[in-house]
């Protein structure tokens, strides 16, 4: 027999199959050109001394063989004696060490057996009613296919599935979608309606994330407020990375989980924009305001669960950087200005009502005045900070008020509203004899003392009614008692107390008369 022809004789070995686990398998035969054909197969086991024979039986019952030696691939033409227009049965017999091993048979019509390609190029992945839908362009001239998929997770081996028959320019497949683990998919195709035809190779891996992106497990810390009125938000713990199946390790597109940082500035609600989203790696600087920070995880199917943290306001207050002057027309605040064309947000809230919404005012962009100060004024009619109570005032600044990450804290302080001079007057002034020439003066704390940093000092005034001589005694704001010494017995005195702020002199309390009794000696 000629080597290019199928030999219609008995093969040169005994044809008993040894039935061992090794041997030829995965035989596939197909047309490779108008008149050319190819069969190839795998051989499992030691290859030394193995001779392969491709066997073919025609529908008439006549059989022939090709001897391929150690090769596991054979090309032949339509002139090789094998009928290409009619159904034939093919298998491989491998002879080694006096035993023969046989592959499973394939029955097919060679002319119609075109080598099918797997899905090529871009395989689109989407979610459809809780399932995974894959879609791709049908390879050229290969409309009409049967499609299979196989899939695995990081902890499971391949499972086979069927996509069903396809008969269009685009093909698709519905596959199971895992809730919490990533999957690797591969697809293969063969000619529709020819069971004996061979499958294409498996496609490149299609990497699919879980339906739910993982909950981002991260921790934040926030630094101290710097001199520029900003503090750094830092990520203490990076989000854990998703475990991936073998074929999806490396730069596999499709399974990426992206994390975004969503900032919501809770303070200063009257500003132009309260939220901003950033890529997670770009950890921002924040003002001393209160914020909610969310980390949002998302994958190709959309956003997943997010984790939200509350970053409390920085409670550090400035020692009186704010000057407030109350006039007949209204009230004006002054503070050290920032750069040219800065927008300020002035926020205030009665102390003890932190849960309620703060009052907020946004200034137009302003330049520093000649003294380097910025100002904000309001009329008495507006009623702003008009009640006689303690207010917490915070001033924020930004040259880019719409950029949430560019706000900074200018100052945070307290102010006593309304007529602080009168409201702060100490009450319940009492005088007690202390010794032969001294008394102890006590009073109830001023309302101003409820407002941190507002009360600068108390002043106690003592007047000798005989000589009209007056002495004044400054008292620390934390004290509500003073001893007046060097008093003369039998002289009438009046005592008054006032409470002063840094910018305002208080009103004197009602005069309290007293005298030290003259001691009569026995």
């Amino acid at each position: 027999c000629r080597t290019s022809e199928c030999c219609f004789q008995d093969p040169p070995y005994s044809d008993a199959d040894s039935g061992s686990a090794s041997g030829p398998r995965d035989l596939s035969c197909y047309r490779i050109s108008s008149a050319g054909y190819e069969c190839s197969w795998q051989y499992e086991g030691p290859t030394a001394g193995v001779s392969h024979f491709l066997r073919c039986c025609l529908s008439s019952g006549r059989c022939c063989y090709f001897a391929t030696g150690s090769a596991t691939r054979l090309q032949f033409s339509d002139q090789a004696g094998v009928s290409v227009l009619h159904t034939v049965t093919l298998w491989v017999e491998s002879w080694a060490r006096n035993r023969t091993e046989k592959s499973p048979e394939v029955t097919l019509q060679l002319y119609k057996s075109v080598k099918y390609k797997p899905p090529l190029g871009d395989i689109k992945v989407s979610k459809l009613a809780g399932q995974l839908r894959m879609e791709w362009e049908t390879p050229d001239n290969q409309v009409g296919a049967e499609v299979q998929f196989r899939h695995r997770t990081p902890s499971s081996s391949w499972k086979l599935g069927d996509c069903g028959p396809q008969d269009d320019d685009t093909e698709s497949c519905l596959c199971p979608l895992e809730m919490n683990v990533a999957q690797e998919f591969q697809l293969r195709r063969r000619r529709l309606g020819s069971q004996g035809s061979s499958w294409s190779k498996w496609s490149s891996p299609v990497c699919v994330p879980p339906e739910n992106p993982p909950q981002p497990q991260v921790r934040f810390s926030v630094e101290q407020l710097g001199r520029d009125g900003r503090r750094r938000l830092t990520l203490k713990e990076q989000p854990t990375q998703l475990e991936l199946p073998e074929g999806c390790q490396g730069p596999a597109p499709g399974v990426e989980v992206t994390y975004q940082l969503q900032l919501h500035m809770l303070s200063c609600p009257c500003k132009a924009k309260a939220t901003r989203t950033l890529p997670l790696e770009k950890m921002p600087y924040l003002s001393g305001a209160a914020y909610n920070v969310a980390v949002i995880s998302s994958n190709r199917f959309g956003p997943g669960p997010n984790q939200t943290w509350h970053i409390p306001a920085d409670t550090h207050t400035e020692p009186v950087a704010l000057n407030i002057s109350v006039g007949t027309n209204g009230t004006t605040m002054y503070w050290p200005a920032r750069a040219q064309s800065t927008t300020y947000c002035i926020e205030w809230q009665p102390v003890g009502q932190e849960g309620s919404l703060a009052t907020c005012n946004l200034t137009a962009p302003q330049d520093p005045d000649p003294a380097g100060m910025a100002t904000y004024s309001w009329s008495r009619e507006s009623g702003a900070m008009g009640q006689e109570k303690c207010y917490h005032i915070t001033i924020f600044a930004s040259a880019h008020p719409k950029k949430l990450t560019l706000w900074s804290t200018v100052l945070s302080t307290y102010h006593f509203g309304g007529n602080a001079s009168a409201a702060g007057t100490p009450h319940h002034v009492s005088v007690k004899n202390h010794s032969l020439d001294s008394v102890s003066v006590d009073w109830a704390p001023s309302l101003l003392s409820t407002c941190p940093g507002v009360l600068k000092e108390y002043v106690v005034r003592c007047r000798d009614e005989d000589s009209n001589q007056v002495s004044e005694h400054p008292v620390q704001p934390t004290e509500t008692q003073v001893t007046l010494s060097d008093l003369r017995a039998g002289v009438a005195y009046t005592v008054q107390v006032r409470a002063d702020t840094a910018w305002l002199r208080g009103a004197w309390s009602q005069p309290q008369r007293f005298s030290i009794k003259v001691q009569v000696s026995d």
């Epitope: 901003r276 989203t277 950033l278 890529p279 770009k282 190709r300």
Partner: antibody, heavy 119, light 107 residues
Amino acid sequence: EVQLVESGGGLVKPGGSLRLSCAASGFTFSNAWMNWVRQAPGKGLEWVGRIKSKTDGGTTDYAAPVKGRFTVSRDDPKNTLYLQMNSLKTEDTAVYYCTTDPGWEFDYWGQGILVTVSS
Amino acid sequence: DIQMTQSPSSLSASVGDRVTITCQASQDISNFLNWYQQKPGKAPNLLIYDASDLETGVPSRFSGSGSGTDFTFTISSLQPEDIATYYCQQYDNLPLTFGGGTKVEIK
């Protein structure tokens, strides 16, 4: 006023080296992530590389065409960004811009400096 | 790498016309997109950040919209000083990538 001023450009032969500098003022340079972006004559914009702030590790990243040949560095006390360019090729001819990192806080660009690689 | 496809590459419009430029990202970039204006011989100048926010000091005739993969930049009423090349840029992922640019001319 914010300013980024590039210097150190000029004509260099293929295979040669050049070091660009970018002097920054008007903002807290040490906090900023900085980039180099280039623009070949008559063409579009192309990112070259980035350096993070020291507080963020000071790590660098590069575009594929320049990786292994270009190095971005910074000197925070001097408020200066650098681009060391080695093994220059004719296709590296471009105007090189020093910029702050986009989408974070502010977006500043230098006026650009021309680098010509020609024999 | 994320590809940014900008169209058209050039356009000619009359003063007062509404001009629209589109930018398409090859993958989802959320709203991490800038629009720049570049005049001949000058550095690019940021007009829009976060896909739709107007940079401080930029005239309100410029606007941006979109999220995910499809973005639009609009000049509501073209002015003579708007003659320039406009670029989109994504900052979702490294490498930072720009669109090919749109050259805007006056008819």
